[in-house]
Protein backbone atom coordinates (compact mmCIF):
# COMPACT_ATOMS: atom_id res chain seq x y z
CA UNK A 1 0.00 0.00 0.00
CA UNK A 2 1.22 3.49 -0.84
CA UNK A 3 1.39 5.47 2.37
CA UNK A 4 3.64 8.33 1.32
CA UNK A 5 2.74 11.94 0.63
CA UNK A 6 4.50 14.55 -1.45
CA UNK A 7 4.92 18.03 -0.04
CA UNK A 8 5.69 20.70 -2.62
CA UNK A 9 6.31 24.42 -2.72
CA UNK A 10 2.74 24.73 -3.99
CA UNK A 11 1.67 27.78 -5.98
CA UNK A 12 4.62 30.09 -6.39
CA UNK A 13 5.44 33.23 -8.28
CA UNK A 14 8.69 34.79 -9.42
CA UNK A 15 9.92 37.75 -11.40
CA UNK A 16 10.76 37.65 -15.07
CA UNK A 17 14.53 37.29 -15.49
CA UNK A 18 14.92 35.83 -12.02
CA UNK A 19 15.24 32.26 -10.82
CA UNK A 20 13.16 29.90 -8.72
CA UNK A 21 13.69 26.60 -6.92
CA UNK A 22 11.13 23.86 -7.52
CA UNK A 23 11.15 21.54 -4.54
CA UNK A 24 9.26 18.40 -3.60
CA UNK A 25 9.66 16.19 -0.56
CA UNK A 26 8.39 12.65 -0.13
CA UNK A 27 7.45 11.73 3.42
CA UNK A 28 5.51 9.10 5.44
CA UNK A 29 7.04 6.17 3.60
CA UNK A 30 10.13 4.04 3.96
CA UNK A 31 10.18 3.38 0.21
CA UNK A 32 13.49 3.89 -1.57
CA UNK A 33 13.50 6.73 -4.11
CA UNK A 34 15.10 5.36 -7.26
CA UNK A 35 14.44 8.29 -9.57
CA UNK A 36 12.76 11.69 -9.72
CA UNK A 37 11.51 13.06 -13.05
CA UNK A 38 10.73 16.75 -13.45
CA UNK A 39 8.19 17.69 -16.11
CA UNK A 40 6.71 20.94 -17.35
CA UNK A 41 3.30 20.22 -18.82
CA UNK A 42 4.22 17.74 -21.55
CA UNK A 43 7.99 18.26 -21.55
CA UNK A 44 10.63 16.30 -19.69
CA UNK A 45 12.92 18.84 -18.02
CA UNK A 46 15.29 16.74 -15.97
CA UNK A 47 15.81 13.40 -14.27
CA UNK A 48 17.69 12.57 -11.10
CA UNK A 49 18.52 8.88 -10.81
CA UNK A 50 19.94 7.31 -7.66
CA UNK A 51 22.63 5.49 -9.66
CA UNK A 52 23.21 7.70 -12.70
CA UNK A 53 22.82 11.15 -11.18
CA UNK A 54 21.27 14.04 -13.10
CA UNK A 55 20.25 14.31 -16.73
CA UNK A 56 19.04 17.71 -17.93
CA UNK A 57 17.18 17.77 -21.24
CA UNK A 58 19.47 19.48 -23.78
CA UNK A 59 16.87 22.07 -24.75
CA UNK A 60 16.73 23.27 -21.13
CA UNK A 61 20.44 23.00 -20.28
CA UNK A 62 21.04 26.75 -20.38
CA UNK A 63 18.24 27.58 -17.95
CA UNK A 64 17.83 24.57 -15.69
CA UNK A 65 20.23 23.60 -12.93
CA UNK A 66 20.06 20.45 -10.80
CA UNK A 67 19.30 20.77 -7.12
CA UNK A 68 19.29 21.63 -4.39
CA UNK A 69 18.84 17.99 -3.45
CA UNK A 70 16.21 16.40 -5.66
CA UNK A 71 14.83 19.84 -6.54
CA UNK A 72 15.31 21.86 -9.68
CA UNK A 73 16.40 25.46 -10.21
CA UNK A 74 14.92 27.41 -13.12
CA UNK A 75 16.92 30.43 -14.22
CA UNK A 76 16.40 33.41 -16.54
CA UNK A 77 12.64 33.06 -16.17
CA UNK A 78 10.32 34.22 -18.92
CA UNK A 79 6.55 34.65 -18.94
CA UNK A 80 6.41 31.47 -21.05
CA UNK A 81 7.66 29.52 -18.01
CA UNK A 82 4.31 30.13 -16.31
CA UNK A 83 2.44 26.86 -15.85
CA UNK A 84 2.33 23.51 -14.11
CA UNK A 85 5.42 21.57 -13.07
CA UNK A 86 5.42 18.01 -11.83
CA UNK A 87 7.86 16.05 -9.71
CA UNK A 88 7.42 12.33 -10.29
CA UNK A 89 9.01 10.15 -7.63
CA UNK A 90 9.72 6.58 -8.69
CA UNK A 91 10.06 4.48 -5.56
CA UNK A 92 10.58 0.88 -4.56
CA UNK A 93 8.45 -0.88 -3.55
CA UNK A 94 5.64 1.69 -3.42
CA UNK A 95 5.57 2.81 -7.04
CA UNK A 96 5.06 6.33 -8.34
CA UNK A 97 4.18 9.51 -6.44
CA UNK A 98 3.45 12.78 -8.22
CA UNK A 99 3.58 16.33 -6.89
CA UNK A 100 2.32 19.45 -8.65
CA UNK A 101 3.68 22.99 -8.53
CA UNK A 102 2.14 25.99 -10.29
CA UNK A 103 4.59 28.72 -11.22
CA UNK A 104 3.53 32.18 -12.28
CA UNK A 105 6.21 34.40 -13.77
CA UNK A 106 5.36 38.06 -13.25
CA UNK A 107 6.52 41.13 -15.12
CA UNK A 108 6.44 43.26 -11.99
CA UNK A 109 8.18 42.91 -8.64
CA UNK A 110 5.02 41.72 -6.90
CA UNK A 111 6.15 38.11 -6.86
CA UNK A 112 5.61 36.24 -3.62
CA UNK A 113 5.63 32.63 -2.62
CA UNK A 114 2.42 30.74 -1.96
CA UNK A 115 1.77 28.48 1.00
CA UNK A 116 3.11 24.95 1.14
CA UNK A 117 0.56 22.23 0.64
CA UNK A 118 0.41 18.45 0.47
CA UNK A 119 -0.76 16.04 -2.19
CA UNK A 120 -1.77 12.68 -0.76
Amino acid sequence: MMTGTIETTGNISAEKGGSIILQCHLSSTTAQVTQVNWEQQDQLLAICNADLGWHISPSFKDRVAPGPGLGLTLQSLTVNDTGEYFCIYHTYPDGTYTGRIFLEVLESSVAEHGARFQIP
Epitope: T34, Q35, E39, D42, N49, D51, L52, H55, S59, Y92
Partner: antibody, heavy 118, light 107 residues
Framework: EVQLLESGGGLVQPGGSLRLSCAAS????????MHWVRQAPGKGLEWVAA????????GYADSVKGRFTISRDNSKNTLYLQMNSLRAEDTAVYYC???????????WGQGTLVTVSS | DIQMTQSPSSLSASVGDRVTITCRAS??????LNWYQQKPGKAPKLLIY???SLQSGVPSRFSGSGSGTDFTLTISSLQPEDFATYYC?????????FGGGTKVEIK
Amino acid sequence: EVQLLESGGGLVQPGGSLRLSCAASGFTFSSYSMHWVRQAPGKGLEWVAAISSNTGSIGYADSVKGRFTISRDNSKNTLYLQMNSLRAEDTAVYYCARVPYDVWIDYWGQGTLVTVSS
Amino acid sequence: DIQMTQSPSSLSASVGDRVTITCRASQSISSYLNWYQQKPGKAPKLLIYAASSLQSGVPSRFSGSGSGTDFTLTISSLQPEDFATYYCQQSYSTPLTFGGGTKVEIK
Protein backbone atom coordinates in the same frame (compact mmCIF):
# COMPACT_ATOMS: atom_id res chain seq x y z
CA GLU B 1 33.40 1.55 -25.31
CA VAL B 2 29.97 0.20 -24.38
CA GLN B 3 29.44 -3.34 -25.61
CA LEU B 4 26.53 -5.76 -25.26
CA LEU B 5 27.08 -9.27 -26.54
CA GLU B 6 24.19 -11.73 -26.65
CA SER B 7 24.59 -15.49 -26.78
CA GLY B 8 22.53 -18.63 -26.30
CA GLY B 9 20.27 -18.46 -29.33
CA GLY B 10 19.65 -21.39 -31.63
CA LEU B 11 17.11 -23.88 -32.89
CA VAL B 12 14.71 -25.36 -30.37
CA GLN B 13 11.56 -27.44 -30.63
CA PRO B 14 8.16 -26.08 -29.56
CA GLY B 15 7.76 -26.53 -25.81
CA GLY B 16 11.50 -26.43 -25.31
CA SER B 17 13.68 -24.02 -23.34
CA LEU B 18 16.62 -21.72 -23.97
CA ARG B 19 18.62 -19.36 -21.82
CA LEU B 20 19.95 -16.21 -23.43
CA SER B 21 22.86 -14.28 -21.95
CA CYS B 22 24.05 -10.75 -22.55
CA ALA B 23 27.59 -9.88 -21.48
CA ALA B 24 28.02 -6.17 -20.81
CA SER B 25 31.26 -4.21 -20.78
CA GLY B 26 32.48 -0.63 -20.98
CA PHE B 27 30.10 0.82 -18.40
CA THR B 28 28.90 0.36 -14.83
CA PHE B 29 26.40 -2.41 -15.52
CA SER B 30 24.87 -2.31 -12.03
CA SER B 31 23.69 1.30 -12.53
CA TYR B 32 21.44 0.66 -15.52
CA SER B 33 18.06 -0.86 -16.19
CA MET B 34 18.35 -3.52 -18.86
CA HIS B 35 15.75 -4.77 -21.32
CA TRP B 36 15.18 -7.49 -23.88
CA VAL B 37 13.57 -6.55 -27.21
CA ARG B 38 12.85 -8.97 -30.03
CA GLN B 39 12.19 -8.79 -33.76
CA ALA B 40 10.49 -11.57 -35.69
CA PRO B 41 11.81 -12.10 -39.23
CA GLY B 42 10.64 -9.25 -41.46
CA LYS B 43 8.62 -7.69 -38.64
CA GLY B 44 8.88 -4.75 -36.28
CA LEU B 45 10.34 -4.40 -32.79
CA GLU B 46 8.59 -5.90 -29.77
CA TRP B 47 9.54 -5.23 -26.14
CA VAL B 48 9.92 -8.44 -24.14
CA ALA B 49 11.09 -7.74 -20.58
CA ALA B 50 12.87 -5.30 -18.31
CA ILE B 51 14.79 -5.38 -15.05
CA SER B 52 15.86 -2.42 -12.95
CA SER B 53 19.42 -1.84 -11.81
CA ASN B 54 18.86 -3.35 -8.37
CA THR B 55 16.41 -6.04 -9.61
CA GLY B 56 13.65 -4.37 -7.56
CA SER B 57 11.43 -3.85 -10.57
CA ILE B 58 10.77 -6.43 -13.28
CA GLY B 59 8.25 -6.33 -16.11
CA TYR B 60 7.16 -8.56 -18.96
CA ALA B 61 5.14 -8.32 -22.15
CA ASP B 62 1.83 -10.20 -21.87
CA SER B 63 2.95 -12.47 -24.70
CA VAL B 64 5.78 -13.95 -22.60
CA LYS B 65 4.47 -13.57 -19.04
CA GLY B 66 4.68 -16.82 -17.09
CA ARG B 67 7.04 -18.38 -19.66
CA PHE B 68 10.07 -16.06 -19.70
CA THR B 69 12.16 -14.89 -16.75
CA ILE B 70 14.56 -11.97 -16.85
CA SER B 71 17.42 -11.81 -14.36
CA ARG B 72 20.84 -10.26 -13.94
CA ASP B 73 24.09 -10.91 -12.14
CA ASN B 74 25.72 -7.57 -11.43
CA SER B 75 28.89 -9.26 -10.20
CA LYS B 76 29.28 -10.88 -13.64
CA ASN B 77 27.98 -7.90 -15.66
CA THR B 78 25.52 -10.25 -17.31
CA LEU B 79 21.83 -10.11 -18.19
CA TYR B 80 19.79 -13.29 -18.72
CA LEU B 81 16.52 -14.36 -20.31
CA GLN B 82 15.26 -17.81 -19.40
CA MET B 83 12.72 -18.87 -22.03
CA ASN B 84 10.46 -21.84 -21.32
CA SER B 85 7.48 -23.36 -23.17
CA LEU B 86 8.71 -21.85 -26.40
CA ARG B 87 6.30 -21.38 -29.28
CA ALA B 88 6.76 -20.85 -33.01
CA GLU B 89 5.76 -17.21 -32.55
CA ASP B 90 8.75 -16.67 -30.26
CA THR B 91 11.03 -17.04 -33.29
CA ALA B 92 12.93 -13.77 -33.50
CA VAL B 93 16.23 -11.99 -33.11
CA TYR B 94 16.55 -11.11 -29.42
CA TYR B 95 18.39 -7.92 -28.49
CA CYS B 96 19.56 -6.91 -25.07
CA ALA B 97 19.49 -3.19 -24.48
CA ARG B 98 20.72 -0.59 -22.00
CA VAL B 99 18.08 1.87 -20.81
CA PRO B 100 19.38 4.92 -18.93
CA TYR B 101 16.81 6.62 -16.73
CA ASP B 102 14.23 4.05 -17.87
CA VAL B 103 13.44 6.37 -20.76
CA TRP B 104 15.46 5.56 -23.89
CA ILE B 105 17.50 2.68 -25.29
CA ASP B 106 20.94 4.08 -25.98
CA TYR B 107 22.82 0.85 -26.72
CA TRP B 108 21.71 -2.42 -28.28
CA GLY B 109 23.49 -5.71 -28.64
CA GLN B 110 23.99 -7.26 -32.07
CA GLY B 111 21.18 -9.74 -31.40
CA THR B 112 20.90 -13.50 -31.18
CA LEU B 113 18.52 -15.55 -33.32
CA VAL B 114 16.07 -17.92 -31.64
CA THR B 115 14.25 -20.30 -33.96
CA VAL B 116 11.39 -22.39 -32.59
CA SER B 117 10.51 -25.15 -35.03
CA SER B 118 9.91 -28.86 -35.14
CA ASP C 1 -1.43 -0.83 -23.36
CA ILE C 2 -0.46 2.30 -25.25
CA GLN C 3 -0.71 1.84 -29.01
CA MET C 4 1.78 3.65 -31.24
CA THR C 5 0.69 4.36 -34.80
CA GLN C 6 3.34 5.40 -37.29
CA SER C 7 2.72 6.88 -40.70
CA PRO C 8 3.44 6.40 -43.47
CA SER C 9 4.46 2.74 -43.35
CA SER C 10 6.79 3.40 -46.27
CA LEU C 11 7.88 6.30 -48.43
CA SER C 12 10.08 6.93 -51.44
CA ALA C 13 12.33 9.96 -51.44
CA SER C 14 15.38 11.36 -53.14
CA VAL C 15 18.70 12.49 -51.71
CA GLY C 16 18.29 16.06 -50.49
CA ASP C 17 14.55 15.73 -49.80
CA ARG C 18 12.97 16.81 -46.54
CA VAL C 19 11.29 13.79 -44.96
CA THR C 20 8.70 13.79 -42.20
CA ILE C 21 7.50 10.73 -40.28
CA THR C 22 4.69 10.96 -37.74
CA CYS C 23 3.87 8.89 -34.69
CA ARG C 24 0.63 9.02 -32.71
CA ALA C 25 0.07 7.56 -29.25
CA SER C 26 -3.31 6.21 -28.16
CA GLN C 27 -3.07 8.33 -24.99
CA SER C 28 -0.87 11.17 -23.74
CA ILE C 29 2.72 10.09 -23.17
CA SER C 30 4.10 13.54 -22.30
CA SER C 31 7.47 13.64 -24.07
CA TYR C 32 8.42 10.00 -23.41
CA LEU C 33 8.92 9.25 -27.10
CA ASN C 34 12.07 7.97 -28.79
CA TRP C 35 13.06 7.46 -32.42
CA TYR C 36 15.34 4.71 -33.76
CA GLN C 37 16.88 3.95 -37.13
CA GLN C 38 17.44 0.37 -38.25
CA LYS C 39 19.28 -0.92 -41.30
CA PRO C 40 18.86 -4.48 -42.60
CA GLY C 41 20.64 -7.07 -40.47
CA LYS C 42 21.68 -4.49 -37.88
CA ALA C 43 20.51 -3.50 -34.42
CA PRO C 44 18.45 -0.32 -34.08
CA LYS C 45 20.25 2.94 -33.35
CA LEU C 46 18.93 5.73 -31.14
CA LEU C 47 18.38 9.02 -32.97
CA ILE C 48 16.10 11.14 -30.78
CA TYR C 49 15.09 10.65 -27.15
CA ALA C 50 12.49 12.38 -24.99
CA ALA C 51 10.71 13.62 -28.14
CA SER C 52 13.24 16.26 -29.18
CA SER C 53 16.70 15.54 -27.73
CA LEU C 54 19.32 14.60 -30.32
CA GLN C 55 21.41 11.63 -29.26
CA SER C 56 25.15 12.30 -29.15
CA GLY C 57 26.83 11.62 -32.50
CA VAL C 58 23.63 11.79 -34.53
CA PRO C 59 23.73 14.32 -37.41
CA SER C 60 21.81 17.54 -36.85
CA ARG C 61 19.68 16.94 -39.95
CA PHE C 62 17.58 14.69 -37.69
CA SER C 63 15.12 16.44 -35.40
CA GLY C 64 12.14 15.47 -33.32
CA SER C 65 9.16 17.42 -32.08
CA GLY C 66 5.81 16.96 -30.40
CA SER C 67 4.34 16.15 -27.02
CA GLY C 68 1.23 14.51 -25.64
CA THR C 69 -0.01 12.24 -28.41
CA ASP C 70 1.47 13.57 -31.66
CA PHE C 71 5.14 13.41 -32.60
CA THR C 72 7.25 14.00 -35.67
CA LEU C 73 10.68 12.90 -36.87
CA THR C 74 12.13 15.15 -39.56
CA ILE C 75 15.16 14.58 -41.76
CA SER C 76 15.93 18.01 -43.18
CA SER C 77 18.01 16.83 -46.14
CA LEU C 78 18.00 13.11 -46.82
CA GLN C 79 21.43 11.53 -47.28
CA PRO C 80 22.26 8.18 -48.93
CA GLU C 81 23.00 6.60 -45.54
CA ASP C 82 19.54 7.58 -44.23
CA PHE C 83 17.68 4.97 -46.28
CA ALA C 84 16.51 2.66 -43.53
CA THR C 85 13.51 1.80 -41.34
CA TYR C 86 12.54 4.20 -38.56
CA TYR C 87 10.66 3.28 -35.38
CA CYS C 88 9.07 5.37 -32.66
CA GLN C 89 8.79 3.99 -29.13
CA GLN C 90 7.03 5.17 -25.99
CA SER C 91 8.56 4.81 -22.55
CA TYR C 92 5.75 6.46 -20.60
CA SER C 93 4.53 3.15 -19.21
CA THR C 94 5.10 -0.57 -19.48
CA PRO C 95 4.70 -2.46 -21.64
CA LEU C 96 6.99 -0.32 -23.76
CA THR C 97 5.54 -0.19 -27.25
CA PHE C 98 6.94 0.56 -30.69
CA GLY C 99 5.35 1.95 -33.79
CA GLY C 100 5.09 -0.36 -36.79
CA GLY C 101 8.00 1.28 -38.54
CA THR C 102 8.48 3.51 -41.59
CA LYS C 103 10.67 2.25 -44.41
CA VAL C 104 12.42 5.07 -46.26
CA GLU C 105 13.34 3.92 -49.74
CA ILE C 106 15.17 5.50 -52.66
CA LYS C 107 12.89 7.03 -55.28
